[in-house]
Interface confidence: medium
């Protein structure tokens, strides 16, 4: 005979666990239904009645199947200088990220408390390590035979063009100038760019069943430019 399908709430067999999207209620000592994302447990189950779920209120959410008594609060509104990369809905938290060209310099579990502009490498210096969501650009002096003539948070040092006859030798901040009409070899025109940091933020998850920790959200502190560092400018 096929096994009967149990309807929640039901007492599990000794040593067995509750099924997917069910949880074991210690008080009722029964397997009971979890609430779907976007809902929370309004009334916990008993031996005779199943969990009663209710929709999350505005500005609150649950992302997973759960039995939390209240939905989690969405993080603070984004500041005017931030980008809201994920809106607050009943099923997901708001995510605010530092705007392009900025990175998070001071963070807490709730997210970024201080966004700062990415360092710009001045002429004679190129990007050694590109900025990310949480780290600044690292600049390095252009090595002999290379140059950078820009103030940029993305440009690397480029090789000097090789001339048949050099009119003006190149240096760290200027390309070589050739006398002949065309150099023997030159780089493709235009600056070489490193890609801007791309968000690698993982999908935020909410603990189940413990609702005490919320997923992180990023925040911005409007601020002035950073002071120049060696080989960099705060502009």
């Amino acid at each position: 005979l096929p096994a009967q399908v149990a309807f929640t709430p039901y007492a599990p067999e000794p040593g067995s666990t509750c099924r997917l999207r069910e949880y074991y209620d210690q008080t009722a000592q029964m397997c009971c239904s979890k609430c779907s994302p976007g809902q929370h447990a309004k009334v916990f189950c008993t031996k005779t009645s199943d969990t009663v779920c209710d929709s999350c209120e505005d500005s609150t959410y649950t992302q997973l199947w759960n039995w939390v008594p209240e939905c989690l609060s969405c993080g603070s509104r984004c500041s005017s200088d931030q980008v809201e990369t994920q809106a607050c809905t009943r099923e997901q938290n708001r995510i605010c990220t530092c705007r392009p060209g900025w990175y998070c310099a001071l963070s807490k579990q709730e997210g970024c408390r201080l966004c700062a502009p990415l360092r710009k490498c001045r002429p004679g210096f190129g990007v050694a390590r590109p900025g990310t969501e949480t780290s600044d650009v690292v600049c390095k002096p252009c090595a002999p035979g290379t140059f950078s003539n820009t103030t940029s948070s993305t440009d690397i040092c480029r090789p000097h063009q090789i001339c048949n006859v050099v009119a003006i030798p190149g240096n760290a901040s200027m390309d070589a100038v050739c006398t002949s009409t065309s150099p023997t070899r030159s780089m493709a025109p235009g600056a070489v760019h490193l890609p801007q940091p791309v968000s690698t933020r993982s999908q935020h998850t909410q603990p189940t069943p413990e609702p005490s920790t919320a997923p992180s959200t990023s925040f911005l502190l409007p601020m002035g430019p950073s002071p120049p560092a060696e080989g960099s400018t705060g502009d």
Epitope: S76, R77, Q109, E110, G111, L114, P211, S212, T213
Partner: antibody, heavy 120, light 111 residues
């Protein structure tokens, strides 16, 4: 306007616990931190920790870890600070203060303070 | 922990004169061009009141005779022209990292 109103003075015996409340109004309670700072009579200010009411996340000063518990009730916009295993040196005025998540990152509004006296 | 040391411990200044309070941190409280140092005023029987945030920003409603300066480890609160109502204890505080810490306080009186 932003207001933080704290519960009244308490007298406790050594070894007991005290729970101080801080009711917030005039802003979105879940958006900013509530910090707790204490001040013994004639002494300076000492930061005990903070809670982010939106999530319930807490950050405690190591000095008070194990003795302090910060909680909140979002529905009534109230934060709580409970200090256990009280000793005479815990006699102090306890303040709650709001600290914005971003912007100032300083405690820009304070409660009126709650005097806790620990005496046998 | 970051230790903040204020100097002097107390200060007596004539009305209308300049008062200067210093605060030195045991390590830098700067991060990406911002100084996470703040100044508070506390009068007897009252909670502290924020005067200056992030080293040099005047809190709304605070008279402009108060100003803050400094970066890294050394910070200054200046009262350009002391008024009778400025008699209080002044505290510096850092929020660069947990645990947040306060200076021991500087008492300002009228000479």
């Amino acid at each position: 306007q932003v207001q933080l109103v704290q519960s009244g003075a308490e007298v406790k015996k050594p070894g007991a616990s005290v729970k101080v409340s801080c009711k917030a109004s005039g802003y979105t309670f879940t958006d900013d931190y509530i910090d707790w700072v204490r001040q013994a009579t004639g002494q300076g200010l000492e930061w005990m920790g903070e809670i982010y009411p939106g999530s319930g996340n807490t950050y405690y000063n190591e000095k008070f870890k194990g003795r302090v518990t910060m909680t909140r009730n979002k529905s009534i916009s109230t934060a709580y600070m409970e200090l256990s295993s009280l000793r005479s040196e815990d006699t102090a005025v306890y303040y709650c203060a709001r600290s914005q998540v971003y912007g100032k990152i300083a405690m820009d509004h304070w409660g009126q303070g709650t005097l806790v006296t620990v005496s046998s | 922990d970051i230790v903040l040391t204020q100097s002097p411990d107390s200060l007596a200044v004539s009305l209308g004169e300049r008062a200067t309070i210093n605060c030195r941190a045991s390590e830098s409280v700067d991060n990406s061009g911002n100084s996470f140092m703040h100044w508070y005023q506390q009068k007897p029987g009252q909670p502290p009141k924020l005067l200056i945030y992030r080293a040099s920003n005047l809190e709304s409603g605070v008279p402009d005779r108060f100003s803050g300066s400094g970066s890294g480890t050394d910070f200054t609160l200046t009262i350009s022209s002391l008024q009778a109502e400025d008699v209080a204890v002044y505290y510096c505080q850092q929020s660069k990292e947990d645990p947040y810490t306060f200076g021991q306080g500087t008492k300002v009186e009228i000479k």
